[in-house]
Interface confidence: low
């Protein structure tokens, strides 16, 4: 039987797990699937981590590919750096290992690219179109600690069956992450259920010590207990519940206090009522009802920007509509003349240069930069009317090219369940399906953002869409989410589904990646709330159509918008955006928009940051990284970060000085 038709599998160490999901997904879908389980796409940064991935993936079929957590925005090539301008989905570019299948090319990198790992051979990295569905994906889950696998006992009827917090069920684990459950069946007919929990003395361990399979006591049916049966000294049995559950009135069954809890967002067992409610980052408990969460409203300050205000963690930036440019004060906008038309022409020239159009996602994988023409670049050059974001533009496609709308897999977690402790701070609970279409809307001209009115129509509080302002008084800056939501009361024509044009502002310290909104329809207004943004999540900037399509009442159509809002590095405060941030520049990290589907050209003005990171040489240029043997596979090597014609194509273990080079703000992600 083809192992790729089988269930997901995982390999865990004491502090993290890698899981392989053999499911055909695009990069965005794979990223979201990992996030929904509380993890991220795999980021094998060291030879040791790569070895763990190798052992998990094994010798798969030669043609199979697995997404890992590396992506690069269009025109972000940095060929002299180990990751070639790619960024981990955790938001940084630090690595002590690379495993490129091919040399870097000096092409213009016209499209967004993502990286997949070959399931066969040396598990080399291939880059390609993010919108292509490959054979599977690798997730990585970090945790506070792990319990060792249980030793088999003589009285067991079979091996322990483990269920991880990310819903993998197997008997094959060596380590079980905190929150895992072990089910042991005994020959005497009863069984035991153990939870990997925090121990009072510190660390983690199983909720119950062995031996688990004694021939007397709670047999034959676990003493009638739903969870744990305890044999008391006087011979009678009592029932206990695993952590997070409480004993029901019958003294035998266990109930989840959060199952009936009226928490709007997240619930944690414990507290005087048996549960306590929590709000995701970016939300706070309502003053009149702590079970409800209300959005922390920002950017509503009138006059912050003349036209458009985009919020990001720790600050905001002003932008101007098409045909206007930001004045020196960073707030006002003035007409820009015919710049947009020229920008479109320049873009057309660039895309068509060397015959390297955008990429065709029907093509199979290839490993060099710039491969795969997705959509002919000329499609982007169609003339457009001034954008009115109350109207949903939709390009026409031949019938056989009509974009498919991939829904995220509904299996894990159950769509309406709030994440359980201890994962409430990191699991994305998607309460409505998010629909992503990677097709190309008709674009405004190249260098100008779409027109988004900064002043809102007068609406009732319920219909207003929050725009986040500069600072949360009650949160550290690294956890402040950014949302720009713009209301329009005009309705789109009935036959056109609305779309959300997503853009991703550059983010700072928290290594944040995008999240997906919960959406409620309020009259003719679509109110979008982003779920709270825990670390490793980035905000979306959204412009909203007014009405959801009748065929998908609970779905948002996310449509990527190619127009870029430039983020200017801190070394260029005089350029045309306003950046107000309490965050120290030394800690600013460029983060990719991991959710932005591919094939969208990044339409940036050709500004080069003045603070380009210079290569760093290790202190000991002749020191070697430890050689990790791999079965006829690439061995790690030391590569000095010196200027060279192109980066290494083989697996590379970099000197420690390389790790010190945190990503400066020389990549601008939107």
């Amino acid at each position: 039987q083809d192992p790729w038709a089988a269930e997901p599998r995982a390999a865990c160490g004491p502090s993290s797990c890698y899981a392989l999901f053999p499911r055909r997904r695009t990069f965005l879908e794979a990223w979201r699937a990992c996030r929904e389980l509380g993890g991220d796409l795999a980021t094998p940064r060291t030879p040791e981590e790569a070895q763990r991935v190798d052992s998990l993936v094994g010798a798969g079929p030669a043609s199979r590919l697995l997404w890992i957590g590396l992506q690069r925005q269009a025109r972000q090539c940095q060929l002299q750096r180990p990751l070639r301008g790619f960024t981990w989905t955790t938001g940084d570019q630090d690595t002590a290992f690379t495993n490129w299948a091919q040399p870097a090319s000096g092409g213009p990198c016209p499209a967004q690219r993502c990286v997949a790992l070959e399931a066969s051979g040396e598990h080399r990295w291939l880059e390609g179109s993010c919108t292509l569905a490959v054979d599977g994906y690798l997730c990585q889950f970090g945790f506070e600690g792990a319990c060792p696998a249980l030793q088999d006992e003589a009285g067991q009827a079979g091996p322990a069956v483990y269920t991880t917090p990310f819903h993998l069920v197997s008997t094959e684990f060596e380590w079980l992450p905190f929150g895992s459950v072990a089910a042991v069946q005994c020959q005497a007919g009863r069984g035991a259920s153990l939870l990997c929990v925090k121990q009072p003395e510190g660390g983690v361990g199983w909720s119950r010590a062995g031996p688990l399979c004694l021939g007397t006591g709670c047999s034959p049916d676990n003493g009638g207990c739903e969870h744990e049966c305890v044999e008391e000294v006087d011979g009678h049995v009592s029932c206990r519940c695993t952590e997070g559950f409480r004993l029901a009135a019958d003294g035998r069954s266990c109930e989840d206090p959060c199952a009936q809890a009226p928490c709007e967002q997240q619930c944690e067992p414990g507290g005087p009522q048996g549960y306590s409610c929590h709000c995701r980052l970016g939300f706070r408990p309502a003053e009149d009802d702590p079970h409800r969460c209300v959005d922390t409203d920002e950017c509503q300050i009138a006059g912050v920007c003349q036209q458009m205000c985009v919020n990001y963690v720790g600050g905001f930036e002003c932008y101007c509509s098409e045909g206007h440019e930001l004045e020196a004060d960073g707030i006002s906008c003035s007409p820009a003349g015919a710049m947009g038309a020229q920008a479109s022409q320049d873009l057309g020239d660039e895309l068509l240069d060397d015959g390297e159009d955008e990429e065709d996602e029907d093509e199979a994988w290839k490993a060099f930069n710039g491969g795969w023409t997705e959509m002919p670049g000329i499609l982007w050059m169609e003339p457009t009317q001034p954008p009115d974001f109350a109207l949903a533009y939709r390009p026409s496609f031949p019938e056989d090219r009509e974009p498919q709308i991939p829904y995220p897999e509904p299996t894990w977690p159950p769509p309406l369940s709030a994440p359980r402790v201890p994962y409430h701070s990191s699991v994305l609970s998607v309460t409505r399906p998010v629909v992503v279409s990677a097709t190309h809307p008709t674009l405004p001209s190249a260098h100008q953002p779409p027109v988004i009115p900064a002043t809102h129509p007068a609406l009732s509080r319920d219909h207003q869409i929050p725009v986040i302002a500069a600072n949360y008084p009650d949160l550290p800056s690294a956890y402040q989410p950014g949302i720009l939501s713009v209301s329009h009361s005009a309705q789109p024509p009935a036959h056109q589904p609305p779309m959300i044009s997503t853009k991703y502002p550059e983010l700072f310290p928290a290594h944040q990646s995008p999240m997906f909104p919960d959406t409620r329809v309020a009259g003719t207004q679509t109110t979008t709330h982003l779920p709270g943004i825990p670390p490793n999540h980035a905000p979306l900037v959204t412009t909203l159509g007014a009405q959801l399509p009748p065929q998908a009442p609970d779905a948002l159509v996310l449509r990527t918008q190619a127009t870029q809002l430039p983020i200017i590095p801190t070394a260029q405060p005089s350029l045309t955006t306003t950046s107000r941030s309490p965050v120290s520049p030394a800690h600013q990290i460029s983060v990719p928009a991991a959710t932005q589907p591919a094939a969208l050209p990044t339409l940036l003005p050709s500004q080069s940051p003045t603070n380009q990171t210079s290569p760093i040489s290790p202190t000991h240029p002749h020191s070697k990284a430890p050689q990790i043997p791999r079965e006829d596979g690439p061995s790690p090597k030391l590569a000095l970060w010196l200027p060279s014609p192109a980066p290494t194509a083989a697996p590379t273990a970099l000197g420690e000085a390389g790790l010190a080079e945190h990503s400066q703000r020389d990549d601008r992600w939107l």
């Epitope: 290839k366 060099f368 194509a649």
Partner: antibody, heavy 116, light 107 residues
């Protein structure tokens, strides 16, 4: 077993065209970069061209750019090299190779002689 | 283009000797350097990939080292069967280039 078998060589006059083929078997052709490498007695081994696994992305050495075209038929597991405007300095044995960065498998080679 | 210079051009040894072949790159190629063996009237065969990793099926007498610009192929206990030309090749950047080769002869 990985096998690469070239065909289509022979004698051709300068300025004329010739098309080489390479039949691949024993591996998943569509997943690999492929390349042509040539060897002339006077010039040693010389990389000629590479193609991405989908066939749409190609690389050439400067001296053949605009004259040679590398292509592939994934359905037929075949790699091609269309050589136009041939010159005497193109005379060589042409090898088809699987290009995994390095060239891990080579064909037996096919002789191309450009002479009037 | 990255130029690879191999030395010596020809090497004549007696069986059982250990020999070292050199390959020098005009620019750093990291460890993206590979060694091939080519016997008379045969196709090249990959011996060593990524500067030091032996391919499966290659006798352990063959080893290699180096990174950056200087690389060495070592052959211990040379046998008659080792009579060949040895080429280095870089895959650090386009165009891919080969060295001019070292011809190993047995005295």
């Amino acid at each position: 077993e990985v096998q690469l078998v070239e065909s289509g060589g022979g004698l051709v006059q300068p300025g004329r065209s010739m098309k080489l083929s390479c039949a691949a078997s024993g591996f998943t052709f569509r997943n690999y970069y492929m390349a042509w490498v040539r060897q002339a007695p006077t010039r040693g081994l010389e990389w000629v061209a590479s193609t991405g696994s989908g066939g749409d992305f190609t690389y050439y050495r400067d001296s053949v750019k605009g004259r040679f075209t590398i292509s592939r038929d994934t359905a037929e597991n075949t790699l091609y090299l269309q050589m136009d405007s041939l010159r005497s300095e193109d005379t060589a044995t042409y090898y088809c190779a699987r290009a995994y960065g390095y060239f891990d498998y080579w064909g037996q080679g096919v002789r191309v002689t450009v002479s009037s | 283009d990255i130029v690879l210079t191999q030395s010596p051009t020809t090497l004549s040894v007696t069986p059982g000797e250990t020999v070292s072949l050199s390959c020098r790159a005009s620019h750093s190629v990291g460890t993206n350097l590979h060694w091939y063996q080519q016997k008379t009237n045969e196709s090249p065969r990959l011996l060593i990939k990524d500067a030091s990793q032996s391919m499966s099926g290659i006798p352990s007498r063959f080893s290699a080292s180096g990174s950056g610009t200087d690389f060495t192929l070592n052959i211990k206990n040379v046998e008659f069967d080792d009579v060949s030309s040895y080429f280095c090749q870089q895959t650090q950047s386009w165009p891919l280039t080969f060295g001019s080769g070292t011809k190993l002869e047995i005295k």
